[in-house]
Structure formats: structure tokens, C-alpha cells
Amino acid sequence: TQNKALPENVKYGIVLDAGSSHTSLYIYKWPAEKENDTGVVHQVEECRVKGPGISKFVQKVNEIGIYLTDCMERAREVIPRSQHQETPVYLGATAGMRLLRMESEELADRVLDVVERSLSNYPFDFQGARIITGQEEGAYGWITINYLLGKFSQKTRWFSIVPYETNNQETFGALDLGGASTQVTFVPQNQTIESPDNALQFRLYGKDYNVYTHSFLCYGKDQALWQKLAKDIQVASNEILRDPCFHPGYKKVVNVSDLYKTPCTKRFEMTLPFQQFEIQGIGNYQQCHQSILELFNTSYCPYSQCAFNGIFLPPLQGDFGAFSAFYFVMKFLNLTSEKVSQEKVTEMMKKFCAQPWEEIKTSYAGVKEKYLSEYCFSGTYILSLLLQGYHFTADSWEHIHFIGKIQGSDAGWTLGYMLNLTNMIPAEQPLSTPLSHSTYV
């Protein structure tokens, strides 16, 4: 008789990433009997919630339930009903909510409270909604990519499972770019981490890791743009801002009240003799780059070396995975190839930014104008941040790998967060056991 497959003995987990610009729901799946193995958890679904980030619901919290409905219903469909009650659901909010909490702890708490009540209405095992720290965001991103790359596995493999996998067990650094913050996380080479706030110690699968991490609040791509606009409008002679970070011919009216609606622009706030101003794009990469550099204070460093704003940064070491908006932006610009040098990226950015807005709109007719208009800024910002902010060079650029997915799972903090909260990353190396009986019939 033919062998019949037994019912899959699998488990599921759900993590919602409540970012500054949007919320995404991720569903993960793994074989129940292999929980402690490295690399067995994989993503089976991503659902992007329609609408803005949850912090934007502060004046309309009653709309949060409806906002989350579609993706939660999708999770209901994807996960077998028999598994619903034992499927954990976690929501982690990042820098958008950190910024709201800076304004008011109560406001942030009210938003989270409504989120919790909404998520509790589903048949899953809801485990809570919280604002994760920037340190956690960096750490979990680092765990995610190294878990997916197989870096925690003690077995040396003669084959490579992913394009950028070197056969050694050297971990990858993690570079994460969001809308409101950016994180840099890596294991420095025999370097003392001079500031305790930036030091993490992990024991994973029997090995100790001393990890450096920092999250730069207000230096995600959206908040960096608000900062740049607030800085540049200070010196504008009238209500026209000729902006090198937007394509020639691009025009957009900005409300001054919107400009100052974030704690990130506080340092540039001033009284302007107008309520609105118009951005007029002039599309000049070099000038855009120069304007962006003014957001990084490199004049002060109380350590042996710094990134910017007086934040300690050890010498860069090893390969880095650059994900989230680092990847999305560079992918749009067609600059994610391993073969593209930093000089070539800069050249292509110069050409892209100089292209007239009308031409750009025609070439990318399917892309929303709001996003399309900001790729020149975002690409230039990524280069500025990596080169001047984090001190990558033309030579070390080749160590940056722009990663969207690894083995079908999105690179980002959510997988690492779930692995940690479900205790699926043991401190010690699990004893290798024979294949369980359920594997074959």
C-alpha cells in the first residue's frame, strides 16, 4: 500500500509590525517537533494593513478595530481553525509610537489599549501589544537575518542555502531603515563597546555574542525628510522652497503646521511669515546630499569614534544585510545588485534625481505620486546615511547586501521578536536527536 502522509504537526505565530507609516501582519509556521532547530520557522503570509500607522489614529481611536479587520480575517483564513486558539499574536509598535509617547504617554497608551481590545476579539491567543524599544528593534532584526541565513547553526554545511551566505559562522550585521527611525546592529571585532546603552549580550545555540546596536529616532526616511524641510525652510527668502531632493518641475504645497507636527522638527521650529510653502524641485543630487549632511552633527564625539549626534559606533565589521526601506528604495531604483559599486550607485542617483518630474511620472505610471516623488530624496538619504552616517566606504560598500526576503521570509525585526517570545532560540545548542517517528510512515 502507498504511504499516506500523517496530518502536519505544525504551529503558527502572528506578529503585527505597527510601523510609523503602516502596519503589516506576518504569519509564521514551523514543524512542532523541531521548535528548537535553527532555520525551521518560515513566513507563510504577509498582509499589509490599508491605511497609515497606528499613531495616526490618536484623534480617532474608534476606527482602529475596522482598520485591523481585513488582515486579521486573512489570518483566520490562512491558519487552520483547529490551530486558532493556540496561535500566539503579538503586536510590536516602533518609532511612530515612540514619537507619540514623547508627546503624551496617555495618548500612546490609549491607542495601544484600543489595539489590544480589537485584537482580543479574534480567536487567537493574543499576547499583547507594546511599543518595542529601538534597541529591541535592532536586536530582533539582527536575530532574524542571522537565523534565516543559518548563522546560528553549528553544523558547517558544504552547500550554500542563500546567495549571500559565506560558509563561515560570522554573523551578518543588520541595517534597518523605517519611516521614523533607523537601526544599525553588528558584532564588532574585538572592540569594546564604549557606551553601555549600545551593548547587548546574547547566548544563542551555545555561543556568546557581544552585539553593538543603536536606533536613531527621527532618522527614518520620512522623519528625515520632515527634518530636512524644516531646516531648509528656515533660510528660504519666501514661501517657495527650491529643493534639490525633488525632480525638476515637481511642485507640492506643504502646511507649516504639518511640518511641525512631529517632535523630530522641534529643533528647527521657528515662526514663518506664511502658513504654507511650495516645494519646487530642482533635482540636484549633490546639493541634496549636502543638505542631508546638515542633519548629521559630526562635530561632537565623546568616544573614540561616532556615527553622528555623539553616538558611539565601533569600526564596521563583516557583511551587512540592509533591509526594510533600505531594500524597498534601492529595489525601486534598481540598485540592489551585488555588482553595483558605490560609485555606480551615486552616478545613477545623480541621473535619476535630474530627470524631469513629468518624465518620471510617465516612466512609472503605476506608482503613487506621493511615493514616486520621494525616491530621489530617499535614495540620496540612504547613501548619505550609509557613507557619512555609518562610515561605509567605496570599498566596504560591497559588504552591504540589500535584502528583501531570505528563504521566503521578510528581513525585519518581527521574526526575531516571535522567536524570542515563543522561546524558540535556545541559549544552548540542542542535543541532536534522531528523526522523530512522525517524520515517516
Partner: antibody, heavy 123, light 106 residues
């Protein structure tokens, strides 16, 4: 030291308008949420309106919604309350009050108060 | 709106004694409860924020406790300058105050 000084109060007829001002000093004004709280003669305290530090959240008590408008001018370190369609029940001392902080986070409690300005609505 | 009910309306206590003032919220307000003191002709003064934190410059004889719906302000040993009206205020929803407790000399 932190100082909040209200002005603009007075006697006004029902249905008319009045604008109150609160001049702030001794702190970085744009880093703090600001509020108006009132107290009718011989009565308790009643919150009127709030304006968070980055204007993310602007809110009003139901009793004044649609009639009063809170605003701020960070360059002048001044908070305003534009009151229109005034009623007899709006008669009160109006206090300007600053939001407090829980460590690095803003809080919706009131850590500093001005001395108040009296508004009397009477025909 | 969240209704705050203070009790008692008036409390008569002798100097040196302990005074306990209560405040009940009509719904849970977590620990977002704050206490103020007001003397005649003066603006209110913050005493306690977030249920149990002593405001700057306030003597240690003042303390606060509670969470959810039930909160207490305690003055361990009354001084003559403590006779005043005390208000509680919640900030979990848009701010609302209790009607006040008048602390008077017995």
C-alpha cells in the same frame, strides 16, 4: 522659573466673543503641551481644552466644543483661547496650565498653572 | 466622559493627624490619576502625578496610591498649611476633575 501669565479676561455680553492669552516663560515652550482649565465662582475645576506639544492632539470639553478654539504661537511663547457664542455658564476664572512629563514622555496632567483671568458673561 | 467622585466632601482633621482622601473613577483609568491642592484665591498646585509620584517641591508627608478605579491621597501628619481643597484628576481619557474634598481644621 516657569511662569504662566493669563490676560484678556473681562465682562462680555452673551453671544459675544473674547480672546484669552497666556504668556509663558522659563521653559522651552514648544516642548510642552498646554491647556486651559476654568473654575466657576465657588465651584470645582473644569478642563476646557488641550493642545499637545507637536499639535498631534487638540481636544475640547463637550461644553465648549464648536465655540472655543485653542491655539498656540511657539515663536511668541503664547497660548490662546478664542471664545465665541459666550454663555452665562462660561463665567469663570480661566487658568492656563502646562502639561507635565513622565520622564521623557509627555503627560496629561498639569504641573504649572497661571494665576488665572476672570471672564464674566453677563447682559 | 470619565466621572470622578471624591469622598468625603468635607474632612475635619486636627493638626498632626493623618488624613485620607478618596477618589473613585467611573471607569478604569490605569494609574493616570493626579492630585492637586488649592487654597482660596490661589491657582491649584500639583501634589501627586500618576497615582503615586510626588511632584517637585512637595513635602514627603503627601503620598498617593491606587490604580484602576480607586485612588487615595494620604497626608501622614497634617500641618496647618495643608488645610485646603484637594482635587483628583484623571488623564486616561480627556481630563476630568473630581468635585473636590475640603480639608478643614477640626
Amino acid at each position: 522659573q516657569v511662569q504662566l501669565v493669563e490676560s484678556g479676561g473681562g465682562v462680555v455680553q452673551p453671544g459675544r466673543s473674547l480672546r484669552l492669552s497666556c504668556a509663558a516663560s522659563g521653559f522651552t515652550f514648544n516642548n510642552y503641551g498646554m491647556n486651559w482649565v476654568r473654575q466657576a465662582p465657588g465651584k470645582g475645576l473644569e478642563w476646557v481644552a488641550s493642545f499637545s506639544s507637536s499639535s498631534t492632539y487638540i481636544s475640547y470639553a463637550d461644553t465648549v466644543k464648536g465655540r472655543f478654539t485653542i491655539s498656540r504661537d511657539n515663536s511668541k511663547n503664547t497660548l490662546y483661547l478664542q471664545m465665541s457664542s459666550l454663555r452665562a455658564e462660561d463665567t469663570a476664572v480661566y487658568y492656563c496650565a502646562r502639561h507635565g512629563r513622565y520622564g521623557g514622555y509627555g503627560g496629561f496632567y498639569f504641573d504649572y498653572w497661571g494665576q488665572g483671568t476672570m471672564v464674566t458673561v453677563s447682559s | 466622559e470619565t466621572v470622578m467622585t471624591q469622598s468625603p466632601a468635607t474632612l475635619s482633621v486636627s493638626p498632626g493627624e493623618r488624613a485620607t482622601l478618596s477618589c473613585r473613577a467611573s471607569e478604569g483609568v490605569k494609574s493616570y490619576m493626579h492630585w492637586y491642592q488649592q487654597k482660596p484665591g490661589q491657582a491649584p498646585r500639583l501634589l501627586i502625578y500618576k497615582a503615586s509620584n510626588l511632584a517637585s517641591g512637595i513635602p514627603a508627608r503627601f503620598s498617593g496610591s491606587g490604580s484602576g478605579t480607586e485612588f487615595t491621597l494620604t497626608i501622614s501628619s497634617l500641618q496647618s498649611e495643608d488645610f485646603a481643597v484637594y482635587y483628583c484628576q484623571q488623564s486616561w481619557n480627556d481630563p476630568t476633575f473630581g468635585q473636590g474634598t475640603k480639608l478643614e481644621l477640626k
